[in-house]
Structure formats: structure tokens, C-alpha cells
Interface confidence: medium
């Protein structure tokens, strides 16, 4: 079941999925001056069996001018693309991404792809939020949103995240340095993420499921 809406927008924050559930679609979008090849698929689809998931189809872009020139998929690691509505500031670094059953990893870039990626998420998808550069969270640890099915409708849960401006006085001024975490867990710069259905202030949690590690930078 596809999620009806995009994940919630959080002021001065961006989101990222670290793994995509089977059924997720990624539009094959090309940058200006390029178009999808005529025989090319309009989207990539995360599909799989019990042991392995991968993206079906390949996105290919060709120059709008040169009608018969096909540009093959050439991964360019320096071109890390992000989902529509996000402007990731390279603050989210996947440090040890282990394959999650029933999930696909971020697809590699294709040549001349658009600067924004448009995903169509499915129920059960989790995305993680972080404040953009120049802003920081009033808490440490990840904030997440999950697409849930409730009363026959899909809804994204609300990440309890507030990003405060470090230089702009109008953006929640007067923030103090965070005190020690009340539960005594260390507030390291690496947060282990637990995929739960509890989406409130996410404090540092010792994860039993070491699926992936999310490295975040706090000023």
C-alpha cells in the first residue's frame, strides 16, 4: 500500500530513508536538458524475495537534443541525490548499513539524473530527520517518522523534533547546552537507531537491533 502523502515537513530539518521497503518506487527523473530514454522505465521498483531485495529497472537519461544518444547508468558517488522536498546538507552519513530483509538500499546515481529524487513510499517505511546546517535539535538522537495505516488511511507519524537557529535570534533563541541524559546513557556522536513505532523525542537508546548506524554532527 502506497503512502498517500509525503513525510512531514519539519522546519529547518531534512529527512532521509536509510533503507526502502519493498514496493517503494523511485521516479526516473532527468536533469534539465535531458529526458528519459524512449524505451526506459518511468520508475525503479524495490522488489525481492525472502532473501534478497533489489531495484527493478534502471533509470537512463538521454540528451534532449541528441535523440538517439543513450546515456548508460554510471554511478557517480560524489553526486549523492536526495528525495524531493529535502535539501540534505551531507549531515547524514550511513556508517555501517547492513542489508535489512525486505528492504532495498539507496539506489546508486545514474548519469544526468535530476537533482531531487522523488520516492513513492509504502506503509511501514521509516524516515529519519536531522536539522540542516546552522540549526540544531533541542535533543540528541534521531527523530523519525513512519508511514502507518490507520482507519483505512495512510498517515505519517510526527517526529518530535525542533530545530533551533544558532545564529538567527528569531529561531527559538537562548538555547542552552544540553544536560546529561536522564537515563544515564551516553550521548555519543553516533546514535544507534531502533526501528520502533514510538515517535516522540528520541533519546539515545542502546539498540539491540544493530541494523544501521547513523552518524550525526552536533555543534
Amino acid at each position: 500500500e502506497l503512502c498517500d502523502d509525503d513525510p512531514p515537513k519539519i522546519t529547518h530539518a531534512t529527512f532521509k530513508a536509510v533503507a526502502y521497503k519493498e514496493g517503494t518506487m523511485l521516479n526516473c527523473e532527468c536533469k534539465r536538458g535531458f529526458r528519459r530514454i524512449k524505451s526506459g522505465s518511468p520508475y525503479m521498483l524495490c522488489t525481492g524475495n525472502s532473501s534478497h531485495s533489489s531495484w527493478d529497472n534502471q533509470c537512463q537519461c538521454t540528451s534532449s537534443a541528441a535523440r538517439n544518444t543513450t546515456k548508460q547508468v554510471t554511478p557517480q558517488p560524489e553526486e549523492q541525490k536526495e528525495r524531493k522536498t529535502t535539501e540534505m546538507q551531507s549531515q547524514m552519513q550511513l556508517a555501517d548499513q547492513v542489508s535489512l530483509p525486505g528492504h532495498c538500499r539507496e539506489p546508486p546515481p545514474w548519469e544526468n539524473e535530476a537533482t531531487e529524487r522523488i520516492y513513492h513510499f509504502v506503509v511501514g517505511q521509516t524516515v529519519y530527520y536531522q536539522c540542516v546546517q546552522g540549526y540544531r535539535a533541542l535533543h540528541r538522537g534521531p527523530a523519525e517518522s513512519v508511514c502507518k495505516m490507520t482507519h483505512g488511511k495512510t498517515r505519517w507519524t510526527q517526529p518530535q523534533l525542533i530545530c533551533t537557529g544558532e545564529t538567527e535570534p528569531s529561531q527559538f533563541p537562548g538555547e542552552e547546552e544540553p544536560q546529561a541524559s536522564p537515563d544515564g546513557l551516553p550521548e555519543s556522536e553516533t546514535s544507534r537507531l531502533v526501528t520502533t513505532t514510538d515517535f516522540r523525542i528520541q533519546t539515545e537508546v542502546a539498540a539491540t537491533m544493530e541494523t544501521f548506524i547513523f552518524t550525526t554532527e552536533y555543534q
Epitope: 533541542l138 507519524t157 541524559s181 516522540r200 523525542i201
Partner: antibody
Framework: QVQLVQSGAEVKKPGASVKVSCKAS????????MHWVRQAPGQGLEWMGI????????SYAQKFQGRVTMTRDTSTSTVYMELSSLRSEDTAVYYC???????????????WGQGTLVTVSS | EIVMTQSPATLSLSPGERATLSCRAS??????LAWYQQKPGQAPRLLIY???NRATGIPARFSGSGSGTDFTLTISSLEPEDFAVYYC????????FGGGTKVEIK
């Protein structure tokens, strides 16, 4: 169910300080931000600041900078708002309000305390 | 600081009538706006969040609309318990409230 119970009314002299408490129950205290909002008699609502009960970090409205201090005690699930250098215009009802819910953003106030009237008079 | 301006200051209506309350922001707040109801001697109650989403337990007669700088709270048919003061509040920046609109019985 979620409950926010505030301390009783206070009468203070100008220049003094007041500390209002707000005890939370019915949910995991460290899981949601807590805001403070005040309302002068017959007037509108004014946001004062916010505290993260988990880490204790705070953010205050410019107007109250230097005069307000928000703290929390996780052992009793209580947040405190202390306002110093009181003046007559600080006479107001002070509310604690929990930010957010599963589908509601953290900057909206879903649950409120009953309010604490602070009167500043010489 | 974003200034929120509500109009009218007072709305005199009879039960069963439709109430339309307006809230204007001094700059765009996208759809990040909430509406609260406050009765005398009580704390405010969240009605609408993010411009058009009803909070839990809020009757369907309350609806919100608008985006950018102009927002509207509509009460389709006023019930006796709806006579109160209504406030709007924006959230993209330091939270600020409007001055309120009092809905009174005509």
C-alpha cells in the same frame, strides 16, 4: 490519560522571583517537549519558552531572556519555570503545555496544565 | 518575530449560525498554523493543527483552511458550547499567537 498538574497561585512583590511547577503523568515524561505559555488578565496567549525533559536543553523567547529559567526533575516527572525580577506586568496565568502527539508536531500544544495565577503587587 | 493578526476581535452570532474567523500572518508560515479554543477560567484547547487537521476529539463542525499568510477557522453551525475565544498560532518560527477572536451570543 495525560495530566499536567501545576502548583498553586502565588503573590509576589516586584523584584522577587517565582517558581511554578508542572507535574506530568499519563505518558513517558522524557518523550515530549514541554512549553510554558502565559496569559495576562483579559489578554492573549504568549509563548515563553520550551524545555526538553530528556536532555534538559531549553530555548526561551527573546522577551524573557535572562529572566526565565526552565528546569526539570525526571525522578518526579516535573518541570519548573522560574521567573525573576518580577514586575507588575508579569501578573498572569502561567500554563505548562505539552508539545506534540503521535501525529501532532512538537510546536503545537495538545495538553495543558490548569494554569497558575501569579500576582505581582507591592 | 511573526505577528499574527486575528479578525474580527468580536463576532456576535446566534446558535446554529456559521462562524468564520480569520487569522493573518505578517509573513508566510506555509500551512504551519493551529487554532485553539479557550473558555473563561479554562486552559486553551487545540482544535486544528497544520491549518486543516482536526485534533483528536474535535467535532467535524470545526474546519480550518488557508496557507501562506491567510487562514480561516470555520464553525459550520454554532453550538452553545462553541461560544468562546479562539486563538491562532504559527509554528515555523518562535511560536506566536494571534490576539484572539471572541465569539459571543447575539
Amino acid at each position: 490519560q495525560v495530566q499536567l498538574v501545576q502548583s498553586g497561585a502565588e503573590v509576589k512583590k516586584p523584584g522577587a522571583s517565582v517558581k511554578v511547577s508542572c507535574k506530568a503523568s499519563g505518558y513517558t515524561f522524557t518523550s515530549y517537549y514541554m512549553h510554558w505559555v502565559r496569559q495576562a488578565p483579559g489578554q492573549g496567549l504568549e509563548w515563553m519558552g520550551i524545555i526538553n525533559p530528556s536532555g534538559g536543553s531549553t530555548s526561551y523567547a527573546q522577551k524573557f531572556q535572562g529572566r526565565v529559567t526552565m528546569t526539570r526533575d525526571t525522578s518526579t516527572s516535573t518541570v519548573y519555570m522560574e521567573l525573576s525580577s518580577l514586575r507588575s506586568e508579569d501578573t498572569a496565568v502561567y500554563y505548562c503545555a505539552r508539545g506534540g502527539a503521535e501525529y501532532i508536531p512538537a510546536e503545537y500544544f495538545q495538553h495543558w496544565g490548569q494554569g497558575t495565577l501569579v500576582t505581582v503587587s507591592s | 518575530e511573526i505577528v499574527m493578526t486575528q479578525s474580527p476581535a468580536t463576532l456576535s452570532l446566534s446558535p446554529g449560525e456559521r462562524a468564520t474567523l480569520s487569522c493573518r500572518a505578517s509573513q508566510s508560515v506555509s500551512s504551519y498554523l493551529a487554532w485553539y479554543q479557550q473558555k473563561p477560567g479554562q486552559a486553551p484547547r487545540l482544535l486544528i493543527y497544520d491549518a486543516s487537521n482536526r485534533a483528536t476529539g474535535i467535532p467535524a463542525r470545526f474546519s480550518g483552511s488557508g496557507s501562506g499568510t491567510d487562514f480561516t477557522l470555520t464553525i459550520s453551525s454554532l453550538e452553545p458550547e462553541d461560544f468562546a475565544v479562539y486563538y491562532c498560532q504559527q509554528r515555523p518560527f518562535l511560536p506566536t499567537f494571534g490576539g484572539g477572536t471572541k465569539v459571543e451570543i447575539k
